[in-house]
């Protein structure tokens, strides 16, 4: 495949991540998302900050954003449920649940991802997969096809160093290394998958990408299990 990137990653194998969603605003990719139930996509709350006047939809079963693919389908959003404690000026509680207008048609290219319910930190050094259609270089180029990268989990103490995120990483957040390989603009809301299980959601703060002293920040889904269950119920 071409050397496309999240940042420092590569093009994903087509349809190998059937849980992957593109949250779209007025027909254009805005954020990543992850199918967690037949009718629900989990993303980041900040993604909808600028969407007040626009039409929000969810694309499932896609590899290319522009090319026709048999598995691709665009769903309208029946209900958008941001976490009640999410706020524009913080990265905390940056979660959003989108209820699709109907249950997704499941198949090899569209399938929910199991998410972590046990509220325990992922071991530092664990390699986790992050995927998205976010920018792929420091010029800001956006890819047409899904990209992914494997990133090692970084311990919270290191991530909270003054030189890094200076205490901002609560127990409800986790970090992954960001030395050249990283998630970036447009990847927000997408999944951080460790051992085939959804562990984190890319936060949508305006962080510098690809700088090892500014690790990627991900919302730990296990910490929000009660809220997710209450919305999906």
């Amino acid at each position: 495949p071409p050397r496309g990137r999240i940042l420092g990653g590569r093009e994903a194998e087509a349809h190998a991540r059937p849980y992957m969603a593109s949250v779209q605003l007025n027909g254009a990719h805005l954020c990543g998302g992850v199918l967690v139930a037949e009718q629900w996509v989990l993303s980041a709350a900040h993604c909808l900050e600028d969407a007040a006047d626009g039409k929000v939809q969810v694309l499932l079963g896609a590899h290319s954003l522009s090319q026709p693919e048999p598995s691709k389908r665009l769903y309208d959003v029946l209900r958008a449920v941001p976490h009640p404690d999410s706020q524009p000026d913080t990265i905390d509680h940056d979660l959003l649940l989108l209820q699709l207008s109907e249950k997704a048609t499941l198949g090899p290219a569209v399938r929910p991802l199991p998410w972590q319910r046990v509220d325990r930190d992922v071991a530092p050094g664990t390699l986790c997969d992050v995927a998205g259609w976010g920018i792929v270089n420091h010029a800001g180029r956006r890819p047409d096809s899904l990209q992914h990268v494997l990133l090692p989990v970084l311990d919270r103490a290191t991530c909270n160093r003054r030189t890094h995120h200076d205490g901002a990483i609560t127990e409800r957040l986790m970090c992954a290394e960001s030395n050249r390989r990283d998630s970036c603009k447009g990847d927000s809301g997408g999944p951080l998958v460790c051992g085939g299980v959804l562990e984190g959601v890319v936060t949508s703060g305006s962080r510098v990408c690809g700088n090892r002293k500014k690790p990627g920040i991900y919302t730990r889904v296990a910490s929000y299990a009660a809220w997710i269950d209450s919305v999906l119920a």
Epitope: P2, R3, G4, A28, L30, D50, I135, N137, H138, A139, G140, R141, R142, K185, G186, S206, R207, V208
Partner: antibody
């Protein structure tokens, strides 16, 4: 459709400053990087710098540090290039560029007394 | 900083002819962009990440290379390809352009 509309040509006196604007349509500048590139008459292209409009972070070619200041206003979806202490050497066409992929039409700046 | 040298500075080709121009860096770079600028127009992205064709660019254009040596090839010259071509590197700050290759039609 992605478009970048730049402000009109400028004729300015040596020592003065000028601010050029670049208004985007078809996309939100917060979701990308905006670059500025200069081109002197009959010369090649020079990268001046870029801004991440989401947080205001900028990066410059050291050659333009102190000469150029890049800012952005996300509420109007507009990026700006301010050029200070102008000399005849700053006479050029200045382009704003989204992700080095979509280019504005350019703004001609002429420095002359 | 990375200095990019394009050669030749000026060249001409007949319609249908194959055209190759090069971009040499004084130190290794990981990827190259190529732009086309027709007289009186803004530059246009042709090639990104060394070899990938930008949207809407005819397939007669191709890019290749690695390390310090990169090239842009037009498989069959057409009249509308008469323009100046610039390479640009994204590996190290400051990001730099080559001086350009002016391609004329015979």
């Amino acid at each position: 459709e992605v478009q970048l509309q730049q402000s009109g040509a400028e004729l300015v006196k040596p020592g003065a400053s000028v601010r050029l604007s670049c208004t985007a349509s078809g996309f939100n500048i917060k979701h990308t990087y905006i670059h500025w590139v200069s081109q002197r008459p009959e010369q090649g292209l020079e990268w001046i710098g870029k801004i991440d409009p989401a947080n205001g972070n900028t990066k410059y070619d050291p050659k333009f540090q102190g000469k150029a200041t890049i800012t952005a206003d996300t509420s109007s979806n507009t990026a700006y290039l301010q050029l200070s202490s102008l000399t005849s050497e700053d006479t050029a066409v200045y382009y704003c560029v989204n992700a080095m992929e979509y280019w504005g039409q350019g703004t001609s700046v002429t420095v002359s007394s | 900083q990375s200095v990019l040298t394009q050669s030749p500075a000026i060249m001409s080709a007949s319609p249908g002819e194959k055209v190759t121009m090069t971009c040499s860096a004084n130190s290794s770079v990981s990827d190259m962009y190529w732009f086309q600028q027709r007289p009186g127009s803004s530059p246009r992205l042709l090639i990104y990440d060394t070899s990938n064709l930008a949207s809407g660019v005819p397939v007669r254009f191709s890019g290749s290379g690695s390390g310090t040596s990169y090239s842009l090839t037009i498989s069959r010259m057409e009249a509308e390809d008469a323009a100046t071509y610039y390479c640009q590197q994204w590996s190290t700050y400051p990001w730099t352009f080559g001086g350009g290759t002016k391609l004329e039609i015979k």
